[in-house]
């Protein structure tokens, strides 16, 4: 079951999926001036069996100005653009992607890929949040959101991370606790 909405946005934070549940789709989007090859896939799909998950289909982009298809080449690091789900400032890996059964790793980039990846998540997907540069976590509580099915509708739980600037936190008492990998889970709400 696909999640109806995107994960929630919260002030001064970005989110990232550490691994993608089977059924997740990634749109094959190309950067400006390029388009999908005519016979190319619309999306990549995370599929698998009990022992292994991987991305089906491959995304390929070609210049809008020519009819020639381009070969898939992994761009050099300086060519790789920031993407919506990969813009975290530090690695923050609460789970080992490879060790999660039924999940795919982050797909490698493809040549002339669009600057922002568009994922279609499925129920049970978890994303993790981290404060952007210049902000810090007010508290070390859960920094995640989970797509859940409730009352027949999908919804994302509200992440409990609060990111504050240095000037904001200075007026509040209490020791600043470093942000940590999420332990508590805010997602368990009573179903119908």
């Amino acid at each position: 079951e696909l999640c109806d909405d995107d994960p929630p946005e919260i002030p001064h934070a970005t989110f990232k999926a550490m691994a993608y549940k089977e059924g997740t789709m990634l749109n094959c989007e190309c950067k400006r001036g390029f388009r999908r090859i005519k016979s190319g896939s619309l999306y990549m799909l995370c599929t698998g069996n009990s022992s292994h998950s991987s991305w089906d289909n491959q995304c390929q982009c070609t210049s809008s100005a020519t009819r020639n298809t381009t070969k898939q080449v992994t761009p050099q690091p300086e060519e790789q653009k920031e993407r919506k789900t990969t813009e975290m400032q530090s690695p923050m890996q609460p789970v080992d992607q490879a060790s999660l059964p039924g999940h795919c790793r982050e797909p490698p980039p493809w040549e002339n890929e669009a600057t922002e990846r568009i994922y279609h998540f499925v129920v049970g997907q978890m994303v993790y949040y981290q404060c952007v540069q210049g902000y810090r976590a007010l508290h070390r509580g859960p920094a995640e959101s989970v797509c859940k099915m409730t009352h027949g509708k999908t919804r994302w739980t509200q992440p409990q991370l609060i990111c504050t600037g240095e000037m904001e936190t200075s007026q509040f008492p209490g020791e600043e606790k470093p942000q940590a990998s999420p332990e508590g889970r805010p997602e368990s709400e009573t179903s119908c």
């Epitope: 002030p11 508290h139 859960p142 509200q158 409990q160 609060i162 504050t164 509040f172 508590g184 709400e189």
Partner: antibody, heavy 116, light 107 residues
Framework: EVQLVQSGAEVKKPGESLKISCKGS????????IVWVRQMPGKGLEWMGI????????RYSPSFQGQVTFSADKSISTAYLQWSSLKASDTAMYYC?????????WGQGTLVTVSS | DIQMTQSPSTLSASVGDRVTITCRAS??????LAWYQQKPGKAPKLLIY???SLESGVPSRFSGSGSGTEFTLTISSLQPDDFATYYC?????????FGQGTKVEIK
């Protein structure tokens, strides 16, 4: 169903202490911030601060710092707001809500009246 | 703290009217703004979050817009159930703050 149920109305004298409660159900109470909001008679909403039930971490609005104390007991899914010495100006309706950003669920409110 | 200023303080309107309430922030808060409705003797109810996202179960006649420092709550066709006080709240800069409220009364 998510619910926040607050303790009943209180009538107190100036200088007395008081602790009011907010019990959550229908969700993982320990892992959601609880926000406290004051509404003085005929006035608007005032954001007092926030408490995290899992470890009782608290942050107060500057206006309420030193005036009140937040606490929580996650084992009984209850958050508390307390005063050590009430003043007449503490007369108000107090709401607990589920945070941390906007408040999607609210308690019914506890009316605190302080009068000599 | 960021100051939130609502206008008007009181608004007289009739059923069926289009009603607009404005909320201004003392500094930019991006789109981190919520709107609430409160009826006498009741707890407030969340209507809008992130400036324009309608909370589940809220009628579509309510809408929010704006970003930065100026925001509006619009009721496209005022219903009898909509006579109440409306509050905005910013959640960009900790600690969060409310506007002083706008009372929508029957003309």
């Amino acid at each position: 169903e998510v619910q926040l149920v607050q303790s009943g109305a209180e009538v107190k004298k100036p200088g007395e202490s008081l602790k009011i409660s907010c019990k959550g159900s229908g969700y993982n109470f320990a892992n959601y911030w609880i926000v406290w909001v004051r509404q003085m008679p005929g006035k608007g909403l005032e954001w007092m601060g926030i408490t995290y039930p899992d470890d009782s971490e608290t942050r107060y609005s500057p206006s309420f710092q030193g005036q009140v104390t937040f606490s929580a007991d996650k084992s009984i899914s209850t958050a508390y707001l307390q005063w050590s010495s009430l003043k007449a100006s503490d007369t108000a309706m107090y709401y607990c809500t589920r945070g941390p950003y906007y408040s999607d669920y609210w308690g019914q409110g506890t009316l605190v009246t302080v009068s000599s | 703290d960021i100051q939130m200023t609502q206008s008007p303080s009181t608004l007289s309107a009739s059923v069926g009217d289009r009603v607009t309430i404005t909320c201004r922030a003392s500094q930019s808060i991006s789109s981190w703004l919520a709107w609430y409705q409160q009826k006498p003797g009741k707890a407030p109810k969340l209507l809008i979050y992130k400036a324009s996202s309608l909370e589940s179960g809220v009628p579509s006649r309510f809408s929010g817009s704006g970003s930065g420092t100026e925001f509006t709550l619009t009721i496209s066709s005022l219903q009898p159930d909509d006579f109440a006080t409306y509050y905005c709240q910013q959640y960009d800069r900790f600690s969060w703050t409310f506007g002083q409220g706008t009372k929508v009364e029957i003309k």
